[in-house]
């Protein structure tokens, strides 16, 4: 056989109506956005509007108080992390609208999603720090009277940001722009290619340090705090309980889909049907997690209204009342003057 019997393949199903609108070839299936992507866009839009305005207001209120009020330091850092994350949303929104096409270049692909991840980790780690602060206020009030100062709070925040930066490095290093040949599309994502073990390691570290560990910290801290509060018959124990339940529940609700899909995808073959299904849900999971970036200002306002009975004050003064009230350190009243201090934990960011 000198040459293979090359017969023209059967393209009977292919007619002129099927011809690509041939100047800009596009996959037929990609003309309309998938339902998960549409939902993600709606969430992104709402989160952006509420998150930018709300967190900007929180930053404005807390910035002036951060020198003298420790709670203001916590809220300021959380709001900055959330605010920065929200600023990246228009880019993510644009990419999804364009069927995940990334027209922003290689540098933006490396930096921008990594920056978002940095802020996500920073928020989670700051929450763990705040939880530790709540714990110490209840169980080590004397120590707090002696050592709990603004300087230490800023150091704790710096450590949280530094650790967040370290956790973000793998994402930065492995993030690449890939230009697909057909349909013509530039994609931004991580590519571990030959190193599946490293991909899994990164996913496991992300799950443990970005989800399980903060969750454990919060649960343990608040279990002890609640037990102490109940034993002292604190007047606001019911309200505190509700806040704690909200904190833990929201942590689960908003982060579980993101983390579960992330860990599953790292253990699946990229061409497997399950992987492809999870990939279609990826944007929705990210947008769901992003709700954390806008929820805090809402909680502060709701909490503020709760304490005031009804919204009599202006929004800035209401927030100032909620966010800058310093904790009272007394053994007999080891909880804080304001339940909103505990409510601050709600800021579960990405």
């Amino acid at each position: 056989m000198d040459s293979f019997n090359y017969t023209t393949p059967d393209y009977g199903h292919y007619d002129d109506k099927d011809t690509l609108d041939l100047n800009t070839p596009v996959d037929k299936t990609s003309n309309t956005l998938r339902v998960p992507d549409i939902l993600a866009l709606v969430i992104f839009a709402v989160v952006f509007l509420v998150g930018v305005l709300g967190n900007a207001l929180v930053v404005w209120v807390t910035a002036f108080e951060a020198k003298r009020t420790i709670n203001a330091i916590w809220f300021l850092n959380l709001a900055v992390a959330d605010f920065l994350s929200c600023l990246a949303l228009p880019i993510l929104f644009t990419s999804i609208v364009q069927h995940h096409h990334w027209p922003f270049g290689g540098a933006a692909c490396s930096i921008l999603p990594s920056l978002i991840l940095l802020n996500m980790y920073a928020s989670i780690l700051l929450l763990a720090t705040i939880s530790a602060d709540r714990f110490l206020l209840v169980f080590k009030p004397i120590w707090c009277q002696n050592f709990r100062g603004a300087g230490l709070a800023w150091i704790a925040c710096a450590v949280a940001w530094g650790l967040a930066l370290l956790l973000t490095i793998p994402s930065f290093l492995y993030r690449v722009v890939r230009e697909e040949y057909f349909p013509p599309k530039v994609l931004c994502g991580v590519d571990y290619s030959h190193d599946k073990r490293r991909e899994r390691a990164v996913a496991i570290v992300r799950l443990v340090l970005g989800f399980l560990w903060p969750l454990l910290t919060l649960t343990i801290c608040y279990t002890f705090i609640l037990l102490r509060t109940w034993s002292r018959r604190a007047t606001r124990s019911t309200k505190t309980l509700k806040v704690v339940v909200a904190v833990v529940a929201s942590f689960f609700i908003f982060w579980l889909p993101y983390q579960v899909t992330g860990i599953m995808m790292s253990f699946l073959e990229p061409s497997s049907p399950t992987f492809l299904l999870l990939k279609k849900l990826d944007s929705l999971c990210v947008s769901f997690a992003y709700i954390n970036c806008c929820i805090n200002p809402i909680i502060y306002v709701v909490a503020g209204q709760g304490f005031q009975g009804r919204l009599r004050k202006s929004l800035p003064s209401l927030l100032r009342n909620v966010l800058t009230e310093e904790s009272v350190v007394r053994e007999s009243k080891s909880f804080t003057r304001s339940t909103v201090d505990t409510m601050a934990q709600k800021t579960q960011a990405v």
């Epitope: 393949p9 011809t19 996959d27 037929k28 890939r178 040949y181 590519d191 990229p270 061409s271």
Partner: antibody, heavy 125, light 112 residues
């Protein structure tokens, strides 16, 4: 019978330009993209780019962006590639190859199902 | 660019032998649609290349079933179960997942 008939061997001087042709028959010209591939002895195959004959949409390998100009004449079902500012490195065999635009799960213009016989270009002073 | 690394560069075989050619890509070739666009071509002496296998493991029409392709992600293999005289030539792997499309350096199959 699908055929991609390429023009004969070319001899050109450095700095000159040359236009290679690929005349097709046996299929609907506008329903297939036409790609161009370069082959130098011992250096394997290099993708130059493609033209979509239906709308004259072209896509190049960045390496050949300023070197190759791809065009198509629908009336004669012929694809052309003009190579400009020739250097000795441009001496090679150039192939045209078509890709089927079939739809379906994962189908599309992904592989070269038919190739021309090749045109040998020699750049010499 | 995606670098396609083929091994071995030369493969001397006897008629009826099994032959195996490996191709490794520097990046994952999994397309966003889940498909892998890795193909194999054979260029016989003095001829233009001809398509053997498309999308990792699909034989092109008219290609004998002694040719088979396999692999995933970044590692791919072309196997010839019983080598015949007309199988002599240079085998190229090629990817069309990412731009620019790239080819392996080729594996020369020759008879001992």
């Amino acid at each position: 019978q699908v055929q991609l008939q390429q023009s004969g061997a070319e001899l050109a001087k450095p700095g000159a330009s040359v236009k290679l042709s690929c005349k097709t028959s046996g299929y609907t010209f506008t329903n297939y993209w036409m790609h161009w591939i370069k082959q130098r002895p011992g250096l394997g195959l290099e993708w130059i780019g493609y033209i979509n004959p239906s709308g004259d949409y072209t896509k190049h390998n960045q390496k050949f962006k300023d070197k190759a100009t791809l065009t198509a004449d629908r009336s004669s079902s012929t694809a052309y590639m003009q190579l400009s500012s020739l250097t000795y490195e441009d001496s090679a065999v150039y192939y045209c190859a078509r890709v089927p635009l079939s739809y379906g799960s994962g189908n599309g213009p992904y592989y070269f199902d038919y190739w021309g016989q090749g045109t040998t270009l020699t750049v010499s002073s | 660019d995606v670098v396609m690394t083929q091994t071995p560069l030369s493969l001397p075989v006897s008629l009826g032998d099994h032959a195996s050619i490996s191709c490794r890509s520097s990046q994952s070739l999994v397309h966003s649609n889940g498909n892998i666009y890795l193909h194999w071509y054979l260029q016989r002496p003095g001829q233009s290349p001809k398509l053997l296998i498309h999308k990792v493991s699909n034989r092109f029409s008219g290609v004998p079933d002694r040719f088979s392709g396999s692999g995933s992600g970044t590692d791919f293999t072309l196997k010839i179960s019983r080598v015949e005289a007309e199988d002599v030539g240079i085998y190229f792997c090629s990817q069309s997942t990412l731009v620019p499309l790239t080819f392996g350096s080729g594996t020369k199959l020759e008879l001992k």
